[in-house]
């Protein structure tokens, strides 16, 4: 049994780091493998993560952490029974993938404006709370070419757009994702999408 692709890990900079790797053949990850991880700290102890299958030869493990600070460094040991298959280290602050925003809502009751709001996925005491910016994706269910991205570079988790910028009388979907430039993160996963009917009517012209 050998590791084909070494583990790579990303942290949500809160409580979970996810490590993925590939074996050289079909593997029952949860019964055959264990990933041991330990914070490099005088009083820390090793924790065991039981991996799950992620495709035939792929494995994924979710490492639970109390929290994360920039100085944290973890040692990682991948075991198959008594055999050490791979040894490495992981600094969560250098491999961050933020949590996806939640509770995306489209408010259509504001006269000519669509207001999209969502929730910041971090608590106020987390470093990323005040450093996230967002991308909002809006697309038409009827027309695949009607697909747009709005970059939200301010901290408030909301976006206002004129209803007239979208076609009237058809259904749209929206989703949102987050990243933090200052922490050099990747983009988060997209939030679940939300659907609404754009019923904006052009005002009658006065002659």
């Amino acid at each position: 049994m050998k590791v084909l692709q070494e583990p790579t890990c990303v942290s949500d900079y809160m409580s979970i780091s996810t490590c993925e790797w590939k074996m050289n053949g079909p593997t029952n990850c949860s019964t055959e493998l264990r990933l041991l991880y330990q914070l490099v700290f005088l009083l820390s102890e090793a924790h065991t993560c039981i991996p799950e299958n992620n495709g035939g030869a792929g494995c994924v493990c979710h490492l639970l952490m109390d929290d994360v600070v920039s100085a944290d460094n973890y040692t990682l040991d991948l075991w198959a029974g008594q055999q050490l298959l791979w040894k490495g280290s992981f600094k969560p602050s250098e491999h961050v993938k933020p949590r996806a925003p939640g509770n995306l809502t489209v408010h259509t009751n504001v006269s000519d404006t669509l207001l999209l709001t969502w929730s910041n996925p971090y608590p106020p005491d987390n470093y990323l709370y005040n450093h996230l910016t967002y991308a909002v994706n809006i697309w038409s269910e009827n027309d695949p070419a009607d697909f747009r991205i709005y970059n939200v570079t301010y901290l408030e988790p909301s976006l206002r757009i004129a209803a007239s910028t979208l076609k009237s009388g058809i259904s749209y979907r929206a989703r949102v994702r987050a990243w933090a430039q200052c922490a050099n993160t990747t983009w988060s996963e997209w939030s679940p999408s939300t659907k609404w009917h754009n019923s904006y009517r052009e005002p009658f012209e006065q002659h």
Epitope: F41, L42, L43, S44, E45, D66, A71
Partner: antibody, heavy 116, light 111 residues
């Protein structure tokens, strides 16, 4: 709410023994390393000893090595410090502290006086 | 003699910004993070800053920490009378397999 309550302090003669206890509540005791820190009257803080969450690894300050023993009972959520061969310079308030990178929660302390 | 050196005293007037330093000796390993504790008169110490610059929840953002090599500093802005206390720096010393604490700095708020 995290609470740490020390007990067992008192007056003891030089060469005597004392056992301090620290009852923990409000958090999962078995998941945290713990430590003892002391403060002699009018002096600064001095780290005494620390123990990992399972008790597998233990550390002592040079000043108490060989005389003090730290231990824990995770089933009772209690930390202990057995102090033997006590000296006058061990007179201090002894604080129990939870460890999360630093000493993030402290008890109110128990006074140990070593005097003849 | 502590491995970490702090000034024995510091002072400032209300509203001022004061800084307390904590210096490791030249041979002191610089891999560890610094922590800061506040001890108000007659009470147990309280964690103020951990891992160089992180504030536990409930600690006002008037308190900030920084690290440079083997030294650290604690800054208190908008000084208040209730900040009058003893302040200690500390770090895990992996060469000693233990925790080292500075001698403490007594902060006096004047006026």
């Amino acid at each position: 709410e995290v609470q740490l309550l020390e007990s067992g302090g008192g007056l003891v003669q030089p060469g005597g023994s004392l056992r301090l206890s620290c009852a923990a509540s409000g958090f999962t005791f078995s998941r945290h390393a713990m430590a003892w820190v002391r403060q002699a009257p009018g002096k600064g803080l001095e780290w005494v000893s620390a123990i990992t969450s399972s008790g597998r690894s233990i550390y002592y300050a040079d000043s108490v090595k060989g005389r003090f023993t730290i231990s824990r009972d995770n089933s009772k959520n209690t930390l202990y410090l057995q102090m033997n061969s006590l000296r006058a310079e061990d007179t201090a308030v002894y604080y129990c502290a939870r460890v999360h990178r630093a000493f993030d929660y402290w008890g109110q302390g128990t006074l140990v006086t070593v005097s003849s | 003699q502590s491995v970490l050196t702090q000034p024995p005293s510091a002072s400032g007037t209300p509203g001022q910004r004061v800084t307390i330093s904590c210096s490791g000796s030249p041979l002191f390993p610089d891999s560890g993070s610094f922590n800061w504790y506040q001890q108000l008169p007659g009470t147990a110490p309280k964690l103020l800053i951990y891992a160089d610059s992180h504030r536990p929840s409930g600690v006002p953002d008037r308190f900030s920490g920084s690290k440079s090599g083997t030294s650290a500093s604690l800054a208190i802005s908008g000084l208040r009378s209730e900040d009058e206390a003893d302040y200690y720096c500390g770090t895990w010393d992996y060469s000693l397999s233990g925790y080292v604490l500075g001698g403490g700095t007594k902060l006096t708020v004047l006026g």
